[in-house]
Interface confidence: low
Amino acid sequence: KESCDVQLYIKRQSEHSILAGDPFELECPVKYCANRPHVTWCKLNGTTCVKLEDRQTSWKEEKNISFFILHFEPVLPNDNGSYRCSANFQSNLIESHSTTLYVTDVKSASERPSKDEMASRPWLLYR
């Protein structure tokens, strides 16, 4: 029988390169069986992860998995950094791997970002 543990499917070392001024949705894929867990986003500041309590979030449900979304409307230069989602489930805290946003400030970008491959390892953000 498949495990009914809550799982957060953010693949480690995941990254997003995004432009300041654009809208963006950061997704935390969550697998659960019965009751949906309480999920929060936090932003890493050194070794601590600061909870993002005043940000717009929403849920998107799909057949096999759900997504807890952190909305950036729009992306700001200081949104650059690493984020983590956490789920509270039956008094257990489950933390995802961190995902990093690289924000390019359009005003300072003289050209489009390079389309050269950045990773030799085949990391994918989520499945």
Epitope: I18, N64, P113, K115, D116, M118, P122, L124
Partner: antibody, heavy 127, light 108 residues
Framework: QVQLVESGGGVVQPGRSLRLSCEAS????????MNWVRQAPGKGLEWVAV????????YFADSVKGRFTISRDNSKNTLYLQMNSLRAEDTAVYYC????????????????????WGQGTTVTVSS | EIVLTQFPGTLSLSPGERATLSCRAS???????LAWYQQKPGQAPRLLIY???SRATGIPDRFSGSGSGTDFTLTISRLEPEDFAVYYC?????????FGQGTRLEIK
């Protein structure tokens, strides 16, 4: 050269079990997510299961969920498919396939598809 | 689950002709996540196109892919005898991978 070799197929009675193996060579196995894909006689391709490069996450097609288990031993460069409670409709050629994706700086995550396939191993479920 | 429907089911053409194979998704698919494969009898599938339009290593330039959203196309500009095979489209989903049912390209 880059190669995948499946083994373990054969004729088995309904309700019985079988374990398929896929031995990888010529590439760094633990860098890649791996899939099993099957093809029933005269039919099309059906994705069966995937396992992340480090074995941390696994996904299954609805048709095999709860009956099949995917695993890997990165120290042996080997992928496995444990098939339990086999049914006549599981009769097929089973292929293992390497899946490749990479991050591209220009906001694009490129999915390269399944670029390396084994030759397949035949599983026949019959009484 | 995204369903991929390929048409026509069978395409009968002669060497030298142009082949156009279609793949329609039941909902929008990122073009970055769409691939095409070729399979000949008794052989494993072979990756042809990834990212809807990029040729895989070693694939001749007579093969090209296009499309976005729900409609994707594989074009073989001038058919060679070795191109007669079954072609599959495939999409990469967050938790599920799906293939189309295939288009058989046969010699007329």
């Amino acid at each position: 050269q880059v190669q995948l070799v499946e083994s373990g197929g054969g004729v088995v009675q309904p309700g019985r079990s079988l374990r398929l193996s896929c031995e990888a060579s010529g590439f760094t196995f633990n860098n890649y997510d791996m899939n099993w894909v099957r093809q029933a006689p005269g039919k099309g391709l059906e994705w069966v299961a995937v396992i992340w490069n480090d074995g941390s996450n696994k996904y299954f097609a609805d048709s095999v969920k709860g009956r099949f288990t995917i695993s890997r031993d990165n120290s042996k460069n080997t992928l496995y498919l444990q098939m339990n409670s086999l049914r006549a409709e599981d009769t097929a050629v089973y292929y293992c396939a390497r899946e490749v994706f990479t991050m591209v700086r220009g906001i694009i995550i490129t999915y390269y598809g399944m670029d390396v396939w084994g030759q397949g191993t035949t599983v026949t479920v019959s009484s | 689950e995204i369903v991929l429907t390929q048409f026509p089911g069978t395409l009968s053409l002669s060497p030298g002709e142009r082949a156009t194979l279609s793949c329609r998704a039941s909902q929008s698919v990122s073009s970055s996540y769409l691939a095409w494969y070729q399979q000949k009898p008794g052989q494993a599938p072979r990756l042809l196109i990834y990212g809807a339009s990029s040729r895989a290593t070693g694939i001749p330039d007579r093969f090209s892919g296009s499309g976005s959203g729900t409609d994707f196309t594989l074009t073989i500009s001038r058919l060679e005898p070795e191109d007669f095979a079954v072609y599959y489209c495939q999409q990469y989903g967050r938790s599920i991978i799906t293939f189309g049912q295939g288009t058989r390209l046969e010699i007329k």
